[in-house]
Amino acid sequence: QAAPFPELCSYTWEAVDTKNNVLYKINICGSVDIVQCGPSSAVCMHDLKTRTYHSVGDSVLRSATRSLLEFNTTVSCDQQGTNHRVQSSIAFLCGKTLGTPEFVTATECVHYFEWRTTAACKKDIFKANKEVPCYVFDEELRKHDLNPLIKLSGAYLVDDSDPDTSLFINVCRDIDTLRDPGSQLRACPPGTAACLVRGHQAFDVGQPRDGLKLVRKDRLVLSYVREEAGKLDFCDGHSPAVTITFVCPSERREGTIPKLTAKSNCRYEIEWITEYACHRDYLESKTCSLSGEQQDVSIDLTPLAQSGGSSYISDGKEYLFYLNVCGETEIQFCNKKQAAVCQVKKSDTSQVKAAGRYHNQTLRYSDGDLTLIYFGGDECSSGFQRMSVINFECNKTAGNDGKGTPVFTGEVDCTYFFTWDTEYACVHHHHHH
């Protein structure tokens, strides 16, 4: 049986059940290389507390549909009066990066995972030439996830003192110059994740090969190498390579750009101080507030919730958007869709789409940006579920009793962007990270 998601095959992926102190290793096409789980384990459960391993999915006993992968085992599970076997079930959803498998829950018999990934999309619009896993777990099983830094088009310009060259990078994947043909990037060779521009010429100085690595508690490293044979004439016979070290800052701060810290014979060392290198619990919340020792800040957007069936309305040319954030009140236009953001076509109000659901909510504060994300909306033709990204700005004089109002700023590939000036986005900082 052919592998259903070949892009995901090259790596063993990790997922974590933090509540039970369990690390899962997943290889969806072959087997994980862990002796204790046996030679054919596709999903290996490592119980860190008891230091034991259990295979909860066998690569030989795989069954697949377009959006579901199941690995059975021959191990019977303890459900009275049945002869069920332990199994793992991975539900795939379309995403804009390779993404990460997320542990959802487990019963006596089944371990459930969900994976939003380009590999599950109906169309290839989000697929990279080359992309590598972009997250790691530290020794405390906390997730460090750089997926939000991945650019789907364009690139980051590295801060470099050399006026004659410009180094552009992407994170964990190659630079897509077709979707955003900026004049400087247009000449970059396909597949490059590090592109050196000199005058009118552009050179591939690195492609992603291995996934993100954790080198110390708050330092993550990505290594790019030039795969192509044939040396560049300005590299003194060396093969180009790029090392990007992502550093979690010691306290809350605004974002910085990547900086070139060393350069020798086409070996480029880049340091990027960014809160995205910190563990995810430091940056994110599933509720509308971020507070406590762990996050170093106090943010509470819950006063923005609307009651009594009313919604915020944002004009989007062809569409009206109805928003009800930080609550579970149904938007009347989007009846029974559990939508936090509802898109209604002006010319045909029967055309209604959920652009993100209130159960699928993430509040993120990173590098000085406060963002509320609603995902899991109605599918677009690509298979991608509509989502909304609301970027908040602190405004102590916002109207509407300080609440302000969301403003639609645009749409890219079924992701809807809004800005929202409000006094409730004014962040209070603590200092003890």
């Epitope: 509540k19 039970n20 507390k49 829950t105 487990a106 019963t107 006596e108 018999c109």
Partner: nanobody, 111 residues
Framework: QVQLQESGGGLVQPGGSLRLSCAAS????????MDWYRQAPGKQREWVAT???????TYADSVKDRFTISRDNAKNTVNLYMNSLQPEDTAVYYC?????WGQGTQVTVSS
Amino acid sequence: QVQLQESGGGLVQPGGSLRLSCAASGIIFSDNRMDWYRQAPGKQREWVATLASYGWKTYADSVKDRFTISRDNAKNTVNLYMNSLQPEDTAVYYCNSGQYWGQGTQVTVSS
């Protein structure tokens, strides 16, 4: 304040059965992972069985197919059913949740 209290230990003949219980105050078992450990005289404490918060169960090889761990949410207890007991099962049995431990209950298997 969290307290765990084991009960049900005793003297049993080889091949016999026992049911150990762990009662809790200050913690809700259904939200937490529970483990049973045991310590035989002169030996290190060893893991016996796990009941995760979601319901999956795992057992040490030495007790697999003989011991069963289960939860009674109404009574907020976790039980360890022990069948086909052997002399090598003689030990003090402890229940554990995170950093919290019970005082232990003695199980002796002897004819």
